[in-house]
């Protein structure tokens, strides 16, 4: 059988290294060797690259080497496949070396900010040594913040006569570390160099970008004062490296700036004790270069009616995220505050919050939450300076079987009946939503019976027991992940009824 006709011929000129062509099929059923016929020097010269011995056959590529690589030039290429049965020739293909030239990557030697120019980095590099001297090179600069996985790109060209191998990358974030990598190609070429070694640079520091501000309203104390826990953090989009030296807080009752109080702190939380009126609170952060824009919060009066607009909320899990979605009857509300914290028996150790804009869903990576912990999630609607009634739900990012089963006791033992009661498993040991309880009971040397009840039931009356018989019993609490048995108890039914 004749070899297959060589097709999909693809050639690339590795500048000052080789000119290599590849083709398909890559493997033939029978032993095949190949000849790549070439004309070069604009047709003046011809030669052949061949894989014509046993160690080099069946190899769908061939390379022409210096000094027979001329540039600029147009090459004509034809591939011949030969086996014991004959020869098959490809179509003739034509290659302009400028269009298929691949050069070495450039080398970035510095990425620096320029004194006094904000949000800019100047990249300096060395043009590849193995590149045509006179040609214009096109470049792609890739950059990302150091903690991001997503690259951004900018394209530009440099004439050789520039000899100015620098590029000013503008509109960056202040005081942020950026990773840079650069590739290049002759302007007419379809083949890019590889990417250069990555280099890191940091933009200049500025005054703080801004703050996100929130509060937790606590019940009024006996003396009528209201504790309000203020909390703030760097605004979304603020530089990762940004550090504040401190925070200034000032607050006053609405329409009464004469009663302004001020506080300075280096913490990101502060408890205020306010009266029953409406208050306005302002916070700024500052560093050696200046202050951030003011973050503002309105604390409603104690008796103020808050609006309610969230009608329903669902929490669902995807492969790697927890997604909370809600439905609202107020289309004008487009900002929401989400709070989440572990539902534990004691005071929660960690409290988190985040603003959501122009969406009615919120997502968090599963790995930011602890598995087997129940989280309380509340969503507050925010309309301008008003905060509405929250809607709350609970969620686990991963359920497990309970760490302990229910503690059980037998009450009201009768001749044929018994009432079983059990305690709720402590929150810290549930490891998931308890969806039901199963009571397993068995007479001595008898068959085991079971009864499953809803999770809101903590007591059950067993009937149709045998009089004067010893029973063993245990209750299993189940989550979606499975069940855990509680302690086993024993009881004996009475021989006669005791009134």
């Amino acid at each position: 059988v004749l070899p297959a006709k060589p097709e999909n011929i693809s050639c690339i000129f590795y500048y000052e290294e080789n000119f290599t062509c590849t083709w398909s099929p890559e493997k033939e059923a029978s032993y095949t060797w190949y000849k790549v016929k070439r004309t070069y020097s604009y047709g003046y010269k011809s030669d052949i690259c061949s894989t014509d011995n046993s160690t080099r056959g069946n190899h769908a590529s061939c390379s022409f080497l210096p000094p027979t690589i001329t540039n600029p030039d147009n090459y004509t290429i034809q591939v011949e496949a030969q086996n014991a049965d004959g020869i098959m020739k490809s179509d003739i293909t034509y290659w302009n070396l400028d269009a298929i030239m691949k050069i070495e990557p450039p080398e970035i030697f510095s990425v620096k900010s320029v004194l006094g120019i904000k949000r800019m980095l100047q990249i300096k590099w060395i043009r590849p040594v193995l590149a045509p001297h006179s040609s214009t090179l096109k470049y792609t600069l890739r950059f990302r913040t150091i903690n991001s996985a997503y690259w951004m790109e900018v394209n530009f060209t440099k004439e050789d006569i520039d000899r100015d191998e620098t590029y000013n990358l503008t509109e960056l974030q202040a005081f942020t570390e950026y990773v840079m990598t650069l590739r290049c190609a002759p302007a007419e070429s379809m083949f890019w160099s590889g990417w250069s070694q990555e280099k890191v640079g940091t933009t200049e520091e500025e005054a703080p970008y801004g703050l996100d501000l929130w509060r937790v309203l606590k019940p009024a104390m006996v003396d009528g004062r209201r504790p309000v826990q203020l909390m703030w953090k760097k605004a979304t989009g603020a530089p990762v490296l940004e550090k504040a030296l401190g925070y200034n807080i000032w607050y006053f009752p609405e329409n009464n700036t004469n009663l302004t109080e001020t506080v300075n702190t280096t913490n990101q939380t502060h408890e205020l004790y306010l009266g029953g009126k409406t208050y306005w609170v302002y916070v700024v952060s500052y560093n050696s270069l200046g202050e951030s824009p003011v973050a503002t919060l309105r604390i409603p009066a104690l008796n103020e009616k808050t609006f309610q607009c969230i009608e329903a909320m669902q929490a669902c899990l995807t492969q790697d995220q927890l997604v909370v979605e809600w439905q609202s009857s107020a289309p004008e509300v487009d900002t929401w505050m989400v709070e989440w914290f572990p539902d534990v028996d004691s005071e929660p150790s960690s409290f988190s919050w985040e603003s959501v804009s122009q969406a009615r869903n919120w997502t968090i990576q599963k790995d930011e939450l602890k598995p087997l912990w129940c989280y309380n999630i509340s969503v507050y609607p925010v309309l301008r300076d008003r905060v509405g009634q929250p809607y709350s739900t609970q969620a686990y990012v991963q359920e497990g079987i309970p760490s302990a089963g229910p503690v059980t006791q037998a009450d009201s033992i009768g001749v044929k009946t018994v009432t079983i009661t059990w305690k709720e498993i402590p929150k810290s040991k549930r490891n998931g939503f308890i969806k039901n309880y199963t009571i397993f009971y068995q007479a001595e040397d008898g068959k085991e019976f079971s009864k499953t009840v809803n999770s809101n039931i903590l007591q059950y009356r067993l009937e149709s027991l045998t009089r004067r018989t010893s029973y063993s019993l245990q209750v299993m609490a189940s989550t979606n992940a499975g069940g855990t048995n509680g302690t086993k108890i024993n009881f004996k039914t009475l021989s006669i009824s005791v009134l």
Epitope: K37, G43, K45, S46, D47, I48, T51, S63, F64, L65
Partner: antibody
């Protein structure tokens, strides 16, 4: 047997035209380059023109540039030399020659390389330009 | 164009004696593209040496070629009667292809 047979040589007046033909046999014609080489009476060899295996013109000697045209017809296994504006100094025996890929000693690396050289010559056809 | 100068223009050699012909190019020529031909009396030329030093099929090992850059040499280790004729060098490296003017070898 590899053979090259030239024809078309004749006596022609200066300024006249002539077309030389060279019919090849005994080899796969379109794998080879072809050249025309001439030899004036009692003189040395002069390369006139050539055409590569792909049908591209290799070039022309300065003395014939703009007057002579080389072409090939692979279907007929024939190479042509169209000669216009002939001059007395074009008088010569015109040889048709085959350019074959010959392997140079192993140059190292993963592949073998062949370069094209004139390895077969025809018997020649005489062109005389005279008034 | 590249001018190829051969020396000597004629050479008379006794049978069994060595002979040497020089070919000098007016500019550098790749050794891949330097060729030697022999034209015996009344015949078409024939290929002797290609790529400066590779012998063509059927050529006696009495013939050898060497050189690089602008200087190339053809040597006949022991001249025989059948070696008479005109020897030409040719360069393929630069357009147009050019021949030397020829060296006539005869037997003493």
């Amino acid at each position: 047997e590899v053979q090259l047979v030239e024809s078309g040589g004749d006596l022609v007046k200066p300024g006249g035209s002539l077309r030389l033909s060279c019919v090849a046999s005994g080899f796969t014609f379109d794998d080879y380059g072809m050249s025309w080489v001439r030899q004036a009476p009692g003189k040395g060899l002069q390369w006139v023109s050539g055409i590569n295996w792909a049908g591209g013109t290799i070039g022309y000697a300065d003395a014939v540039k703009g007057r002579f045209t080389i072409s090939r017809d692979n279907a007929r296994n024939t190479v042509y030399l169209q000669m216009n504006s002939l001059r007395a100094e074009d008088t010569a025996v015109y040889y048709c020659a085959r350019e074959s890929p010959l392997r140079l000693g192993d140059l190292g690396g993963d592949y073998f390389y062949y370069y094209y050289y004139i390895d077969v010559w025809g018997q020649g056809t005489l062109v005389t330009v005279s008034s | 164009e590249v001018v190829m100068i051969q020396t000597p223009l004629s050479l008379s050699v006794s049978p069994g004696e060595p002979a040497s012909i020089s070919c000098r190019a007016s500019q550098s020529v790749s050794s891949r593209y330097l060729v030697w031909y022999l034209q015996k009396p009344g015949q078409s030329p024939q290929l002797l040496i290609y790529g400066t030093s590779s012998r063509a099929t059927g050529v006696s090992d009495r013939f050898s070629g060497s050189g690089s850059g602008t200087d190339f040499t053809l040597r006949i280790s022991r001249v025989e009667a059948e070696d008479v004729g005109v020897y030409y060098c040719q360069q393929y490296d630069n357009a147009p292809r050019t021949f030397g003017q020829g060296t006539k070898v005869e037997i003493k």
